[in-house]
């Protein structure tokens, strides 16, 4: 059974940095293995060489460890429009990412989706494209944004937020979201 | 028309079961990839878990993870969501939904289903 993580981080702070208490001998600190590799046996006593094991194909190891197992790569999620930036490596994991022209978007901290960056049709770029973040548009006068995308003034409903931006006026609107779509 | 209803929500104590139904209509089911997710009281929506057409492994919230199981029986045009191990933090209203495709929000989900984790 594996320790809980406050009980391995007080039993690890006992250790110099680098080191780690053997498990059944609270006198003895065991160097940690290298990142690309995984503990395989602990180390016999002081002074004496862990035994540690480099990651099979498909695992990995990012940083100095005592993990038993080395950790499954990542496959980056096709249907959320995904592609591979770089392969899995014994010491580094799957780096996902979108297209050229796309962008992330994050539904929670370890799921993100690829959507194309928005043209600003009927608009100007107020801020361009970024790796996380959709192009800002700015929607010439008698458009409002939905979505993202300019909207002509005629599909706008009483209803809706866009009523004050399409108001009769000479100049440019900055557009902001229209809230009562989604 | 594009048509999702769910079912199988209700009224359950902590570490019980529930299995929730969507029943799809108006599009190829069996094509597109399916979404739970969920509104808890007062708070935003959560991704909960999502199921690609075929080939392609679930996705699964960590705050899930173990104890939900999503599936898809393509020929009935029905998505589930096998709860297990249920606990308070679980109580909300549960959505299915179509993947987005144009941009993050969702054009299609449905009208939600209770579900209640409470002794």
């Known amino acids: 059974l594996v320790p809980p993580l406050r009980d391995r981080e007080k039993r690890d702070s006992v250790c110099p940095q680098g080191k780690y208490i053997h498990p059944q001998n609270n006198s003895v600190c065991c160097t940690k293995c290298h990142k690309g590799t995984y503990l395989y046996n602990d180390c016999p006593g002081p002074g004496q060489d862990t035994d540690c094991r480099e990651c099979e194909s498909g695992s990995f190891t990012a940083s100095e460890n005592h993990l038993r197992h080395c950790l499954s790569c990542s496959k980056c999620r096709k249907e959320m429009g995904q592609v591979e930036i770089s392969s899995c490596t014994v010491d580094r994991d799957t780096v996902c990412g979108c297209r050229k022209n796309q962008y992330r978007y994050y539904w929670s901290e370890n799921l993100f989706q690829c959507f194309n960056c928005s043209l600003c049709l009927n608009g100007t770029v107020h801020l361009s494209c970024q790796e996380k973040q959709n192009t800002v548009c700015t929607c010439h006068a008698g458009f409002f944004l939905r979505e993202n995308e300019c909207v002509s003034c005629s599909n706008c409903k009483k209803t809706l937020e866009c009523t004050k931006l399409c108001l009769p006026q000479t100049e440019n609107v900055k557009g902001t979201e229209d809230s009562g779509t989604t | 028309e594009v048509q999702l209803l769910e079912s199988g929500g209700g009224l359950v104590q902590p570490g019980g079961s529930l299995r929730l139904s969507c029943a799809a209509s108006?599009?190829?089911?069996?094509?597109?990839?399916m979404v739970w997710v969920r509104q808890a009281p007062g708070k935003g929506l959560e991704w909960v878990s999502h199921?690609?057409?075929?080939?392609?492994?679930?996705f699964y919230a960590d705050s899930v993870k173990g104890r939900f199981t999503i599936s898809r029986d393509n020929s009935k045009n029905t998505l589930y969501l096998q709860m297990n191990s249920l606990r308070a933090e679980d109580t909300a209203v549960y959505y299915c939904?179509?993947?987005?495709?144009?941009?993050?929000?969702?054009?299609?989900w449905g009208q939600g289903t209770l579900v209640t984790v409470s002794s």
């Open positions: 939904a179509l993947l987005p495709k144009r941009g993050p929000w969702f054009d299609y």
């Open positions: 108006g599009f190829t089911f069996a094509h597109e990839t």
């Open positions: 199921i690609p057409p075929v080939g392609q492994d679930p």
